[in-house]
């Protein structure tokens, strides 16, 4: 099976408010019906859609993990916003979990940046002032698989 590009995000539920799509799209907080004739509202606190769309369902709301605090709840037009608890942070390259911030810098380095929900403490060498995150350097990874082509189903 082959397909064109995909759009934003979305789910279905019985007995929900309906309206007609505008130029084939439904407003944020809705998804399109299976026959494409109606816009069906998302369920508050359960699912959402953020853009005008023709999604077949609203996307399920994220539940904050233990170790995270909920900054804002899920609405029909916006997903839950979760943030790492104090003393922990989430890195861009491992967004699935909050990691503990380092309590101090390695010997010969001084702290120049505090622990935040999105970064570890920042350390610099006393003499040179060169930046260094609290983490030990990671072993270099070899990428063996190339990224898939955009949206293409079936054999």
């Amino acid at each position: 099976i082959t397909q064109q590009d995909l759009a934003p995000q979305q789910r279905v539920a019985p007995q929900q408010k309906r309206s007609s799509p505008s130029e084939g799209l439904c407003p944020p907080g809705h998804h399109i019906s299976e026959d494409g004739r109606d816009c069906i509202s998302c369920k508050y606190g359960q699912d959402y859609s953020t853009h005008w769309n023709d999604l077949l369902f609203c996307l399920r709301c994220t539940r904050c993990d233990s170790g995270e605090v909920e900054l804002s709840p899920c609405t029909t037009t916006r997903n839950t916003v979760c943030q790492c608890e104090e003393g922990t942070f989430r890195e861009e390259d491992s967004p699935e979990m909050c990691r503990k911030c380092r309590t101090g810098c390695p010997r010969g380095m001084v702290k120049v940046g505090d622990c935040t929900p999105w970064s570890d403490i920042e350390c610099v060498h006393k003499e040179s002032g060169t930046k260094h995150s609290g983490e030990a350097p990671a072993v270099e990874e070899t990428v063996t698989s190339s990224p898939g082509t955009p949206a293409s189903p079936c054999s």
Epitope: I1, A7, L55, L59
Partner: nanobody, 126 residues
């Protein structure tokens, strides 16, 4: 080369069960949403179910919800569809599909079956 090979179809009586599998290769399976779609005789492609890349979120069309269960094994690069309480209207060729996000009305409408795609035939009949 992207390859998706479906299996597990067959002839089953109404109320019976089948488990479909889709073996994926040629792409990083764990990065993609996966769908099951079907094509009944003389009809267009119809979306059946979808699962997000991590497998935590599953979605179904109204007519199969509560009877079908989609799942995936990202270590085995395999997608599954457990079909219970089968009805005659479930008779179709079933295909799996990969995509970068959740299914849209326009996307499903513009899907076409590749010449090389065999799918797996599910026939529900007494």
């Amino acid at each position: 080369e992207v390859q998706l090979v479906e299996s597990g179809g067959g002839l089953v009586q109404p109320g019976g069960s089948l488990r479909l599998s889709c073996a994926a290769s040629g792409f990083t399976f764990s990065r993609y949403w996966m769908y099951w779609v079907r094509q009944a005789p003389g009809k267009g492609l119809e979306w059946v179910s979808a699962i997000n890349s991590g497998g935590g979120d599953t979605y179904y069309r109204d007519s199969v919800r509560g009877r079908f269960t989609i799942s995936r094994d990202n270590f085995k690069n395999t997608l599954y569809l457990q079909m219970n309480s089968l009805k005659s209207e479930d008779t179709a060729v079933y295909y799996c599909a990969k995509a970068e996000g959740p299914p849209t009305f326009s996307l499903i409408r513009t899907m076409t079956v590749d010449p090389g795609a065999q799918g797996t035939q599910v026939t529900v009949s007494s």
